[in-house]
């Protein structure tokens, strides 16, 4: 009798111990990854970023992947993604090319399976910089809820690289699991 | 052996109340907090904005604290923070000291143990406003996921805060809690 | 004994389950909805966007309801709402009627039970948009955290609705629920 | 440090062109405008025009800009300006630049002599 | 083109004397609350030698009797106390528009 009850509560157990690990033992994936400002490409013209930090100061990953300057995904949900991209400069550094300038970001995904990339959100602004003006800045940000695939992969495309502010708290994106696919 | 099955049972529940109230019966703090207009600081100087409406209008706070101008975190976790900071000029309201703006936001933490501030996020935009134009207007958001331990404090700092638009739709900046610290 | 032990199981498995319909069988609501190009509006002034686009692309919706241009909640609780809004002008697709453009959106909640709408969140910025330039482009995102109920309804306003971006990746709104009401 | 250093002394033919160098090093020479001054004899100082020598975009005063070409080759941070269809006017002396890192030209180079004479 | 008009043309200051230098712009040289007026200094067979950037900020190295003032359209160098080194001609140059333009010079001579 007494063998029989714990075969039930093991049961019972069972059932409660598959919910935990999905609602709560097995944590939500996310990322918060900041700009690797070692590795900027130089240039006006539209790159994607592949240098950025996923363990040092804000920076930080769990249950998602950073490799090749993609962040990857592991689990199969819904996620919130969002970036802050911070354009900045200041004459000491040298001189702008243009004072015309298109500042704008994309965040983007590509699937390997089907070897495509698409954009998900994109922002900026048309910016006219004067030569003048000793500092000049402007931020982005973009965020957006969107269902993602294991292996599929998110990256961050901006023009006018030579322009991105270094810092951890200007330029950066994310993502964090919201709920699970139906 | 019923008092057996009862006893097997409380255990189950117990696990199962526990798991209930970590994940749904203590409920996720949050906090939105909108600007308190009669308390704005004059100048064009970068300043700590302390004055935020918690339970008026679409401000609110749940297992969170507001005090002395800064959103002490009380629970350990894994939030979203965001901030969204309006600026705005009406001829009518006098003119500006100078045309060339730096329209800045600033989101920081403070830890009392480490009695020390850091920026988890800015944004903003250098503006020219021509005396010209009647009226001007500019707004930030900023967002970001961050880990934050109970007892840590978020603030506000922006630039010009006399150009502020006070209205609780436009000026306003909160937290959520989207899971725990593993 | 047997039998009674299965009731008693049936009585944990009972709350197990409703604590598993609530936190994850019963699916956290969810819209994110992309600008439908086909019928947006003209002119300059200030107008509800009411074409969106809710399941092709990117866009999605789940436990949400989508109605005569507005996102109805069926399911009160707390929900991120953000939107990001694009607007953008080509010399090759005509003149500006002005150069001085207010590009603003206001994200509005209307309660059925009390036919009144009220300004959630807005952004956006002045600009000078010179006849001399070939292009321009300008991207605004608001987000905030709101309680909401069950038949309110969400909407977008822009001014000037003929210079909005029609990419899926440019003009969208959504929410997505992150906790119950208390 | 910042040095612009320029080809030497040249002599030419009135009708003729002649193009300049001028090698730059101390800096990144992709992020400053290259200007070109010149001096005509017992003159004042004359501005012709600059490049941004990364993606090559030059600006030109008015005066030159039909005889003036500034170009810049990034491999070797040497920036050229060629004139043509030269008179004896323009003998001159002609400066290459950059600006300090705030404002004003805190960089000059040597100068080349050109003498347009038949 | 922004016209620069130097004066005088030439001027002959003794030892120890105040030496001023005007420069007049055709139309302001003000942009982004600054004033895009710098200041040169040229010996024979030399390079001109930036002294003043932005109407009044004095380059690394330039001597603290060299100052300069002014805004808009009306500026000025001064020389506090003249030394024998300080013969040259001085110029004055705009690049608040493009094409960056230069005054005519003044000759300074040390009596």
């Known amino acids: 009798g007494s063998q029989h009850i714990r075969a039930e509560k093991a049961m019972v157990d069972g059932s409660w111990l598959d919910l935990a690990k999905r609602s709560k033992l097995e944590a939500q994936p996310f990322a918060h990854l900041t700009i690797n400002a070692t590795d900027i490409p130089s240039g006006s013209h539209k790159v994607s970023l592949s240098s950025w930090y996923h363990d040092r100061g804000w920076a930080k990953i769990s249950n998602m992947t950073f490799s090749n300057g993609k962040l990857i995904v592991n689990q199969d949900g819904f996620y919130y993604l969002y970036a802050n991209i911070c354009f900045r400069h200041h004459e000491t550094s040298g001189d702008l090319a243009t004072e015309y300038l298109q500042l704008m970001v994309y965040v983007t995904k590509t699937s390997i399976k089907i070897p495509s990339s698409h954009t998900l959100m994109k922002g900026g602004s048309t910016k006219y910089w004067s030569g003048n003006s000793e500092f000049h800045f402007y931020s982005i940000n973009v965020g957006g809820f969107f269902k993602l695939r294991s292996g599929e992969e998110i990256s961050i495309e901006v023009s006018n690289p030579s322009l991105l502010d270094p810092d951890q708290d200007a330029t950066y994106f994310g993502a964090f699991k919201v709920r699970d696919i139906d | 052996g019923s008092q057996h099955i009862r006893a097997e049972k409380a255990m189950v529940d117990g696990s199962w109340l526990d798991l209930a109230k970590r994940s749904k019966l203590e409920a996720q703090p949050f906090a939105h907090l909108t600007i308190n207009a009669t308390d704005i600081p004059s100048g064009s100087h970068k300043v700590s904005l302390s004055s935020w409406y918690h339970d008026r209008g679409w401000a609110k706070i749940s297992n969170m604290t507001f005090s002395n101008g800064k959103l002490i975190v009380n629970q350990d976790g894994f939030y979203y923070l965001y901030a969204n900071i309006c600026f705005r000029h009406h001829e009518t309201s006098g003119d500006l000291a100078t045309e060339y703006l730096q329209l800045m936001v600033y989101v920081t933490k403070t830890s009392i143990k480490i009695p020390s501030s850091h920026t988890l996020m800015k944004g903003g935009s250098t503006k020219y406003w021509s005396g010209n134009s009647e009226f001007h207007f500019y707004s930030i958001n900023v967002g970001g996921f961050f880990k934050l331990r109970s007892g840590e404090e978020i603030s506000i700092e922006v630039s010009n805060p006399s150009l502020l638009d006070p209205d609780q739709d436009a000026t306003y900046f909160g937290a959520f809690k989207v899971r725990d610290i593993d | 004994g047997s039998q009674h032990i299965r009731a008693e199981k049936a009585m944990v498995d009972g709350s197990w389950l409703d604590l598993a319909k609530r936190s994850k069988l019963e699916a956290q609501p969810f819209a994110h909805l992309t600008i439908n190009a086909t019928d947006i509006p003209s002119g300059s002034h200030k107008v509800s966007l009411s074409s969106w686009y809710h399941d092709r692309g990117w866009a999605k919706i789940s436990n949400m309801t989508f109605s005569n241009g507005k996102l109805i909640v069926n399911q009160d609780g707390f929900y991120y709402l953000y939107a990001n809004i694009c607007f953008r002008h080509h010399e090759t697709s005509g003149d500006l009627a002005t150069e001085y453009l207010q590009l603003m959106v206001y994200v509005t909640k209307t309660s059925i039970k009390i036919p009144s709408s009220h300004t959630l969140m807005k952004g956006g910025s002045t600009k000078y948009w010179s006849g001399n330039s070939e292009f321009h482009f300008y991207s605004i995102n608001v987000g905030g955290f709101f309680k909401l109920r069950s038949g309110e309804e969400i909407s977008i306003e822009v001014s000037n609705p003929s210079l909005l971006d029609p990419d899926q990746d440019a003009t969208y709104f959504g929410a997505f629920k992150v906790r119950d009401i208390d | 440090q910042v040095q612009l250093v320029q080809s030497g002394a040249e002599l030419v033919q009135p009708g003729a062109s002649v193009k300049l160098s001028c090698k730059a090093s101390g800096y990144t020479f992709t992020t400053y405008w290259l200007q070109w001054v010149r001096q005509t004899p017992g003159q004042g100082l004359e501005w012709m025009g600059a490049?941004?020598?990364?993606?090559?975009?030059?600006k030109y005063t008015q005066k030159f800009k039909d005889r003036v070409t500034i170009t810049a080759d990034t491999s070797t941070s040497t920036a050229y300006m060629q004139l043509n269809s030269l008179r004896s006017e323009d003998s001159a002396v002609y400066y290459c630049?950059?600006?300090?890192?705030?404002?004003?030209?805190?960089?000059w180079g040597q100068g080349t002599l050109v003498t347009v004479s038949a | 083109n922004i016209v620069l008009t130097q004066s005088p043309a030439s001027l002959s200051v003794s030892l120890g004397q105040r030496a001023t230098i005007s420069c007049r712009a055709s139309e302001s040289v003000d942009s982004y609350g600054r004033s895009f007026m710098h200041w040169y200094q040229q010996k024979p067979g030399q390079a001109p030698k930036l002294l003043i950037y932005?109407?009044?900020n004095l380059e690394s190295g330039v001597p603290s009797r060299f100052s300069g003032s002014g805004s808009r359209t009306d500026f000025t160098l001064t020389i506090s106390r003249v030394e024998a080194e300080d013969a040259a001609t001085y110029y004055c140059q705009q690049d608040n528009e493009d094409p960056y333009t230069f005054g005519g010079g003044t000759k300074l001579e040390i009596k």
């Open positions: 630049a950059r600006r300090g890192s705030r404002r004003g030209i805190a960089y």
């Open positions: 490049i941004y020598p990364g993606p090559g975009n030059t």
């Open positions: 932005l109407a009044s």
